[in-house]
């Protein structure tokens, strides 16, 4: 795997330079991302800007054309004229890029997790890993209360409660996931540590419950299961502490480290080529979506001002929260980087999953955004497990507009309960099966409100949950651009750098190889360890 | 203190329209949805349905959809329950209750109760 | 819907006697049960609610317990003014629905 080669000190320590991913320099970030902003002038000039921006336009133009695609088709008769079969051949191209995704997720998470947790020392991963999960509790946290404050604003239960003019049409509670609290925070833990590494790559743990007659009384009782579905959260885990265990080994790990990253590599290859067929993907994810819809204006004029104060809370987090945090902390132009991730951001939209747009994610950040490898690779799988902005105020507007519906007062207790609980769940949705409604319904039984209503959430789902993933993958790449940031700065401010730091018993004199004419600054240093690791390096195992 | 007041006892035609009102006072009307429930001669107590008082908005029990509106007079913290085209099934006691605003689905005051006799 | 049954429709006690109401949930209510009652004639009262939980003024020789299906309501004194129909009733899930009432009489 290409490293930069280090750079000798005189105290013998080798500070490893945080560009060491093959992707452009530090300080040049800025100069990276200007081909994105500052596109006028000549009709040459013009041509190139489209040229380096190909994907993001096509991208954009994607969705757009799948809105419009889907609309048409709808006004033509929609699913109904299609037929099942039809439609599942419209939906088919949408269907084969989220398979390419998915495809790639597993070895994608696990290799990069081993690799970047491989490459810090404990100390960095230790700090790194902190000073992440501290900016997504936050930036949770923040999401919960503006959920929170907008619903109470613009009251969406008081203006929907007309959608509710018959019981039946609230749902009953046998649609409602009915799941102790307790448990639901029991299996998160037991997907923390899976029993079988290779069914935690398909499979996670459930409870569901039996009735059982016990002494004349029917008692329910808790069962656990597997269900369908990766267990990601316990596969983030293992890979993480499988990574500081192939670290702690020395250079006897260094092998398999090497392996790790070189699978690495190799996967963002494939993600390189499957970017190019987002565009088609995403159209048709899109406009299948929306054909698949039955009386979508009939269910914006009943639910308009719910999702409406769920598109404006993602859109005040998304715009401007999340940007003013990156932008206090830096010092850059926030919209700058995000122009660097609109792709991923249109896939997170097209297909409505984190994980799934974690591969596209990595690719920009590093190549567009100057994020190095060891911090993107370990950050951004953590952030699509942990990082839950979106998920964490849709919950929370849900919860109030629930209130608003069926007329149940939230006072201050209730509303904090709300926001920890909120936070609390969105973290842990990635362990829990059946994530959004299950996590909604266990904020719910919290604060003691109706479950009955949840059909109604589900009703628009398919809309609401497409603008939370884009906030969710958002965050999770500004949390990333951030910790780059903390690198950058902590490295500059010390003569031993804090972070990406490799002792060194022996003196070094590497060879560069030069690998770009016209960038001295990129060279490749092949370290046995790949990122951000030195030949002879001798630490002491911990 | 709280109390929900009633109107007195009606007894009606069969095909005739019937109004029973519910005053509350003692708190803020809008605050607390207003549900009502019938009571059956020697028989249990049926949840007919509430209404959102803040929106205004009627739900109705799957029982009582058609012939009975719930509507409101806010200014004078008032509810109605009225049924239409009334038959003799109809007769009954007929209770408003303030529904809680916590604690899901209970009712923690209640009117006196509004006779309803239906007879030819 | 949640079928609500009290298997005892009339129930006679003694002054000073511990009269014990039960009530069964066709399925798991998660604990949202409410008793109240209601006197010859007159109107209803909440006595409990959330199982145990109980409403203001009503007097402390009434307790509630339970959970899942099974409940009871707890008349620790019996007093004269205690004569009256019992209700239970689940607020789990829409439509609220009642039990069939237990008739407490003096023996």
């Known amino acids: 795997m290409a490293v930069d080669p280090p750079k000798a000190d005189p105290k013998g320590v080798v500070a490893v330079d945080s560009t060491a991913n093959g992707g452009p320099a530090l300080g040049s970030r800025e100069d990276q991302s200007a081909k994105a902003g500052g596109c006028c002038g000549s009709r040459d000039r013009v041509r190139r800007c489209i040229r380096a921006n190909l994907l993001v336009l096509l991208t954009v133009a994607a969705v757009v054309a799948g809105v419009g695609l889907g609309l048409g088709v709808s006004a033509a008769g929609g699913a109904d004229a299609l037929g099942p079969a039809r439609l599942t051949a419209f939906a088919f191209p949408g269907e084969l890029l989220l398979r390419l995704l998915k495809m790639i997720i597993l070895p994608l998470v696990v290799c990069s997790l081993i690799g970047g947790a491989a490459s810090l020392d404990p100390g960095a991963l230790g700090r790194l890993g902190a000073w992440a999960l501290l900016f997504f509790l936050v930036t949770t946290l923040l999401a919960s209360a503006l959920g929170v404050g907008l619903a109470l604003a613009l009251q969406p239960g008081a203006a929907s409660a007309a959608i509710n003019a018959s019981v039946g049409a609230a749902g009953s509670a046998e649609n409602a996931p009915s799941k102790e609290v307790l448990d639901s925070f029991l299996d998160l833990a037991r997907n923390i540590f899976p029993s079988n590494l290779v069914s935690a790559a398909f499979r996670s743990y459930s409870t569901t419950y039996e009735e059982r007659n016990i002494t004349g009384t029917r008692v329910k009782v808790p069962v656990g299961q597997e269900v369908e579905g990766m267990n990601i959260l316990g596969l983030v885990v293992f890979a993480i502490v499988f990574g500081v265990a192939l670290r702690k080994l020395g250079p006897e790990g260094e092998l398999l480290i090497r392996f790790f990253n070189s699978f690495n590599e190799a996967t963002m290859v494939l993600v390189s080529w499957i970017m190019w067929y987002a565009p088609v993907g995403i159209m048709f994810l899109v406009a299948g979506k929306i054909v698949e819809m039955e009386d979508v204006g009939l269910l914006f004029a009943r639910l308009g001002k719910y999702i409406l104060c769920c598109l404006l809370g993602h859109a005040i987090h998304g715009l401007l929260v999340l940007p003013l945090i990156y932008f206090l902390f830096t010092r850059k132009n926030p919209y700058r980087f995000l122009w660097g991730i609109v792709t991923p951001l249109a896939t997170a939209f097209g297909t409505s999953s984190s994980s799934a747009t974690l591969p596209l994610m990595m690719k920009c950040v590093e190549e567009n955004n100057g994020v190095a490898k060891h911090i993107s690779r370990f950050i951004l799988p953590i952030g699509a497990t942990v990082n839950m902005d979106g998920a964490a105020l849709f919950q929370c507007v849900a919860a109030v507009f629930i209130a608003q519906l069926s007329q149940q007062s939230l006072d201050f207790v209730k509303i904090i309960t709300i926001l920890v609980t909120a936070t609390a769940s969105s973290v842990g949705a990635a362990g829990i099966p059946a994530g959004g409604v299950l996590t909604l319904a266990i904020i719910l039984e919290a604060v003691n409100l109706p479950v009955d209503h949840i059909s109604l959430i589900l009703a628009v789902d398919w809309l609401v949950d497409r603008s939370c993933t884009v906030l969710n993958v958002e965050g999770d790449a500004l949390g990333a651009g951030l910790l780059q940031n903390y690198v950058d700065r902590t490295e500059s401010r010390s003569t031993e750098p804090e972070l990406i730091q490799v002792k060194s018993e022996l003196p070094l004199d590497p060879l560069p190889v030069p690998t770009e004419e016209g960038n001295p600054l990129l060279k490749h240093y092949r370290g046995p360890a790949g990122d951000a690791t030195v030949a002879s390096e001798k630490e002491s195992v911990m | 203190q709280i109390q929900l007041v009633q109107s007195g006892p009606e007894l009606k035609k069969p095909g005739e329209t019937v109004k029973i009102s519910c005053k509350a006072s003692g708190y803020t009307f809008t605050t607390f949805g207003m549900s009502w429930v019938k009571q059956v001669p020697g028989k249990g107590l049926k949840w007919m349905g509430w209404?959102?008082?803040?929106?205004?908005?009627?739900i109705y029990g799957d029982d009582f959809k058609g012939r009975f509106a719930f509507s409101l007079e806010t200014s004078a913290s008032t509810a109605y329950l009225q049924i239409n085209n009334v038959k003799n099934e109809d007769t009954a006691t007929y209770f408003c209750?303030?529904?809680?605003?916590?604690?899901?689905?209970?009712?923690?005051?209640w009117g006196q109760g509004t006779t309803l006799t239906v007879s030819s | 819907d949640i079928q609500m049954t009290q298997t005892t429709s009339s129930l006679s006690a003694s002054l000073g006697d511990r009269v014990t109401i039960s009530c069964r949930a066709s399925?798991?209510?998660?604990?949202?049960l409410n008793w109240y009652q209601r006197k010859p004639h007159g109107t209803v009262k909440l006595l409990i609610y959330y199982t145990s939980r109980l409403h203001s003024g009503v007097p402390s020789r009434f307790s509630g317990s339970g959970s899942g299906t099974d409940y009871s309501l707890t008349i620790s004194n019996l007093e004269q003014e205690d004569i009256a129909t019992y209700f239970c009733?689940?607020?789990?899930?829409?439509?609220?629905?009642f039990g069939g009432g237990t008739k407490l009489e003096i023996k």
């Open positions: 399925q798991d209510i998660r604990n949202y």
């Open positions: 209750a303030r529904r809680s605003d916590n604690y899901r689905y209970f009712f923690d005051y």
């Open positions: 209404i959102h008082t803040y929106a205004g908005v009627p």
């Open positions: 009733q689940q607020g789990h899930t829409l439509p609220p629905t």
